[in-house]
Amino acid sequence: FERTRSLQDPCSNCPAGTFCDNNRNQICSPCPPNSFSSAGGQRTCDICRQCKGVFRTRKECSSTSNAECDCTPGFHCLGAGCSMCEQDCKQGQELTKKGCKDCCFGTFNDQKRGICRPWTNCSLDGKSVLVNGTKERDVVCGPSPADLSPGASSVTPPAPAREPGHSPQ
């Protein structure tokens, strides 16, 4: 037991799962039910987080670590430590103050969360649109229009196949 250090600051010896109890001459007391301390030297134990309503428990509280929450199906976490749950939308939609709304033409969202984003502008990279965009998917850019002009192809056509076993005439 580190008695020399405890003479200087008795609280520094209190391990995680306990607190330094001023009501008991600063002895280390285990955290009361439904509270925790995740580090040593604490003067109080923190009340365990309760995952209620739209939150559900991902990890139970213990005397040394807080509960962790996530969101019930149909919702997703926002903020540090899942401090909020936000409603999911379908792909091709975004959440507005009035609920889930389809992405406007020229925008897409391939997730159940987040906002609709503009389709990629292929021409900015000197390319052409290979596959058109939808509410759920971005456009797919292909080669530049110049690469597709007649005579510009660098691909040589394959030689005609010969039937096996026949010698040329």
Epitope: P30, C31, P32, P33, N34, E60, S62, S63, T64
Partner: nanobody, 111 residues
């Protein structure tokens, strides 16, 4: 506050073992948090081991690997098994739950 009753202390040689018991009176239900402390003459009470409210056993560094705490809820008794005892383990040992304390049991390690 209810009175807890410790027993099992005594004189033991270095390297020996003791098992301390802490019994709660029959009129209370199981104790959710229970701890063992030690106290030497003129010293502060120091935590040794405890069973937390989540039923997990915890130990201070000097007790890890040598001491074991567990409880038998049917007997309303908590035990502290002390192995590989050292001279410096000599102290009065108390059990505690909330505001309830035992009278203490003396553990003396001497050759």
């Amino acid at each position: 506050a209810v009175q807890l009753v410790e027993s099992g202390g005594g004189l033991v040689q270095p390297g020996g073992s003791l098992r301390l018991s802490c019994a709660a009176p029959g009129n209370i239900s199981s104790l959710r948090v229970i701890a063992w402390y030690r106290q030497g003459p003129g010293k502060q009470r120091e935590l040794v081991a405890w069973i937390a409210w989540d039923d997990i056993a915890h130990y201070v560094d000097s007790a890890k690997g040598r001491f074991a705490i567990w409880r038998d809820n049917t007997k309303k008794t908590t035990y502290l098994q002390m192995n590989s005892l050292k001279l410096e383990d000599t102290d009065v040992y108390y059990c505690n739950s909330g505001d309830s304390w035992g009278q203490g049991t003396q553990v003396t390690v001497s050759s």
